[in-house]
Interface confidence: medium
């Protein structure tokens, strides 16, 4: 039985030439998360495999950072990153957990907002 | 028009504590997250905590600094235990979407 949920920073909306951060967190089971897929409507983003580690869509490279935690920072924005993403958690024994955030990229009002950063 | 305000940051000895807080308005959030920025280095991320109360943690700092939030007070707090120079910088909080910074509180670790 799935007893798991995910809590997600839910809707977003940020502006163009920003940055965001994705978070999803699974609570209330037990069950070992293998992998973590991130996906923008059909379009993998990136996957963080438990043994693997990270690996970033070759598309998305220049643009997405991993983290925090399963995390995913996507920078440098355009008003085309509109859209649904998806956190899948593949898990053992339960199966597949999936979160939505939905982000809305907005033409800038500041030229200056959404600064880079490191994330260790 | 959203706004975060930090403070509780100050010159602190090495091993020190500081609890740092920012109080966010404008609207409600569901992700908020500490950066610091030390003299010539890039910001960098600290720490976050989801609504809902779960949080993460750079490396650097996991085990001696606690990230917390008072959802009623759209406000969230960054206690600081066992303060080392390396940890002086500009602290930061801001949002999941990081369009907004406040103008962030000094921490100097100097004895």
């Known amino acids: 039985m799935m007893t798991g949920t995910i809590e997600t920073t839910g809707n977003i909306s940020a502006e163009k030439g920003g940055s965001i951060i994705l978070q999803c967190h699974l609570s209330s089971t037990t069950a070992q998360v293998t992998q973590v897929n991130w996906e923008q409507q059909d379009q993998l983003l990136a996957i963080c495999n438990a043994d693997l580690g990270w690996h970033i869509s070759p598309s998305f490279k220049d643009r997405v950072a991993p983290g925090p935690g399963l995390g995913l920072t996507l920078q440098s924005l355009t008003v085309n990153d509109t859209g649904e993403y998806f956190c899948i958690y593949h898990t053992y024994p339960d199966g597949t957990y999936t979160g939505r955030i939905f982000l809305e990229v907005l033409e800038s009002s500041v030229a200056e907002h959404g600064a880079r950063f490191q994330i260790p | 028009e959203v706004q975060l305000v930090e403070s509780g940051g100050g010159l602190v000895q090495p091993g020190g504590s500081l609890r740092l807080s920012c109080a966010a308005s404008g609207r409600t959030f569901s992700f908020m997250g500490w950066f610091r920025q030390a003299p010539g280095k890039e910001r960098e991320w600290v720490a976050s905590?989801?609504?809902?109360?779960?949080?993460w943690y750079a490396d650097s700092v996991k085990g001696r600094f606690t990230i917390s939030a008072d959802n009623s007070k759209n406000t969230a707090y960054l206690q600081m235990n066992s303060l080392k120079p390396e940890d002086t910088a500009v602290y930061y909080c801001a949002t999941e979407s990081m369009d907004y910074w406040g103008q962030g509180t000094l921490v100097t670790v100097s004895s």
């Open positions: 905590v989801l609504r809902g109360g779960y949080t």
